[in-house]
Amino acid sequence: SEVEYRAEVGQNAYLPCFYTPAAPGNLVPVCWGKGACPVFECGNVVLRTDERDVNYWTSRYWLNGDFRKGDVSLTIENVTLADSGIYCCRIQIPGIMNDEKFNLKLVIKPAKVTPAPTRQRDFTAAFPRMLTTRGHGPAETQTLGSLPDINLTQISTLANELRDSRLANDLRDSGATIRIG
């Protein structure tokens, strides 16, 4: 059965998924998809990484953590009730039927009538969105755009401002984690 995670309409949802790279920079392809994990890859892919970088993503979906260290947890921006459902995190470890797959259930609750004001920085304003693409075929050139002039440490620091550190630790403890190597 799927592990369940909750968020309110209008909030950002966080779905944890981690692995430990065998060596620094020795990354494993990962995909995130809406729907339970199928036999291969992910269905309805919302984000992919390869051995080097995020190579496909759609608007509202991103990796806040340091994916180069194996934190491939998915953030979904400004969720609506339609974002409810099962999500697949698939870690594509090379070998014979080595893939690790995790199904995570996201439950979206209606927003409270009078939400308390927050003092979080606007992540979108502080770190402008990368150019998103919607691919329709492998032959189509994917223009992924480039990162703003900001280093990974800054990104991690900025991302951490979006999450209460204790909550993030709780989610990390309860999230999907595997060790490679």
């Epitope: 339970a36 036999v39 890859e41 269905g43 309805n44 992919r48 496909y56 070998g95 039927m97 691919g135």
Partner: antibody, heavy 123, light 107 residues
């Protein structure tokens, strides 16, 4: 035009080996998962093995993975199936198939198939 | 393994008939179901994927429906070229498995 052409089938004695090939053309081979499916005479379809784009990930029918090996050569656009310790029950037409794929989907169904190559295992 | 059971195993019908073929999975496979058509001596042809999405070039008289464990392939008005064997295939669990096939014959 997408084309998949299998070769390498034939008559082999029980315990023997064969290597099937599937030559691909008309598409960017290295963008696609590839699969072998077999069909015994007068019977239904049975999945045999699949391989991801770069050959680093392979998937097998459990009962075959000790005897069969799927591989690919992206430079030559060829898919292979090495079959060892063949048995009479391996007699079938072997099809190679392309995993339907686009960036927002997954290659779990097969949009193009070869014409098949017949493998007969008999003494 | 997930077992896929098709019914009927064979079916006789006439040109113009509406025909429905059923595929049942032994466990929940969500919408991870594909339908293929195969004619004698030929390789299979993709008809429907993800339970209800028509593959490119497939006539609109074909339609797929269902989710979970029960799925159907419907041909709204049979044409002479539709007489063939139809297979369902699940792609939720390893190994990929096919139904045993439904042979559609001319009455």
């Amino acid at each position: 035009e997408v084309q998949l052409v299998e070769s390498g089938g034939g008559l082999v004695k029980p315990g023997g080996s064969l290597r099937l090939s599937c030559a691909a053309s008309g598409f960017t081979f290295s963008d696609y998962y590839m699969t072998w499916v077999r069909q015994a005479p007068g019977k239904g379809l049975e999945w045999v093995a699949s391989i991801n784009y770069d050959g680093r990930n392979t998937y097998y029918l459990d009962s075959l993975k000790s005897r069969f090996t799927i591989s690919r050569d992206n430079a030559k656009n060829i898919l292979y199936l090495q079959m060892n310790s063949l048995r009479a029950e391996d007699t079938a037409v072997y099809y190679c198939a392309r995993g339907y794929y686009y960036y927002g989907s997954s290659p779990n169904y097969f949009d193009y198939w070869g014409q098949g190559t017949l493998v007969t295992v008999s003494s | 393994d997930i077992q896929m059971t098709q019914s009927p195993s064979s079916l006789s019908a006439s040109v113009g008939d509406r025909v429905t073929i059923t595929c049942r999975a032994s466990e929940n496979i969500y919408s991870y179901l594909t339908w293929y058509q195969q004619k004698p001596g030929k390789s299979p042809k993709l008809l429907v994927y993800n339970a209800k999405t028509l593959a490119e070039g497939v006539p609109s008289r074909f339609s797929g429906s269902g989710s979970g464990t029960q799925f159907t392939l419907t041909i709204s008005s049979l044409q002479p070229e539709d007489f063939a064997t139809y297979y369902c295939q699940q792609h939720y669990g390893t190994p990929l498995t096919f139904g045993q096939g439904t042979k559609l014959e001319i009455k």
